[in-house]
């Protein structure tokens, strides 16, 4: 069936999980996700 | 075996609305990101939308407005609500799998397409 | 959008010999260690498969005799020796960034 694993998210710095299409930065503490990065270990936007 | 299953084309006219569906089997759908694609008559292939396994959708800037990715994961089903069209979007409409090993898009199942004319 | 062009437009090989189709990006769609351009082959009346993902990796049940490599903006694939199921169209695609992508194709023929 698969669609079980969750390929680890090889980017630099830490707080990067896979949202969305691609691996995202997560947000601060205290901010929530607007919307997910569009590119491989990009920055999603908090507010 | 994994499926993917496409139907709601035909002829529209310019102006006009229509709604695809993708039945998928043989694998958990829910846990999949997917994406249509579409075939153009000169075969250029042109991603068209896409729907991640935790709820975000996606689109080029160039359609952005006028079409509509969803999905019903209790009927394994993937939707596009496409409308204003015209005839640059006469094309096969192929719904596709993303790959589950990857944290990027790139399709491993394709569907065999339904076919979408618009034309007066 | 990233501008992906591949050449040549059809291709013309013997049994046995080497194909090398090419794609080119717009700007480079290497980023975090990885080069992330892929390859698919269409066969007539079917949708496309993919064959190597990441630039080099072989997918799952796809013959040795097809291989990627590349990086930055050119990248190449190579199939050798031809066989005659080979005949198809090859697409490359990006995913360094929405929208995705794809090449024009290269069609390849068997003499």
């Known amino acids: 069936q698969g669609g079980t694993r969750s390929p680890r998210c090889d980017c630099a710095g830490d707080f990067h999980k896979k949202i969305g299409l691609f691996c995202c930065r997560g947000c601060p503490a205290g901010h929530y996700l607007k919307a997910p990065c569009t590119e491989p270990c990009g920055n999603s936007t908090c507010l | 075996e994994v499926k993917l299953v496409e139907s709601g084309g035909g002829l529209v006219k310019p102006g006009g609305s229509l709604k695809l569906s993708c039945s998928a089997s043989?694998?958990?759908?829910?846990?999949?990101?997917m994406s249509w694609v579409r075939q153009t008559p000169e075969k250029r292939l042109e991603w068209v939308a896409a729907f991640s396994s935790d709820g975000y959708t996606f689109y080029p800037d160039s359609l952005k407005g006028r079409f509509t990715i969803s999905r019903d994961n209790a009927r394994n089903t993937l939707y596009l609500q496409m409308s204003s069209l015209g005839s640059e979007d006469t094309a096969l409409y192929c719904c596709a799998r993303h790959a589950d090993y990857a944290n990027y898009p790139v399709m491993d199942y394709w569907g065999q397409g339904t076919s979408v004319t618009v034309s007066s | 959008d990233i501008v992906l062009a591949q050449s040549p437009a059809s291709l013309l090989v013997s049994l046995g010999q080497r194909a090398t189709i090419s794609c080119r990006a717009s700007k480079s769609v290497s980023t975090s260690g990885y080069s992330y351009m892929h390859w698919y082959q269409q066969k007539p009346g079917q949708p496309p498969k993919l064959l190597i993902y990441l630039a080099s990796n072989l997918e799952s049940g796809v013959p040795a005799r097809f291989s990627g490599s590349g990086s930055g903006t050119d990248f190449t694939l190579n199939i050798h020796p031809v066989e005659e199921e080979d005949a198809a169209t090859y697409y490359c695609?990006?995913?360094?960034?929405?929208?995705?992508?794809f090449g024009a194709g290269t069609m390849l023929e068997l003499k």
């Open positions: 695609q990006h995913s360094r960034e929405l929208p995705l992508t």
């Open positions: 043989g694998f958990a759908f829910s846990n999949y990101d």
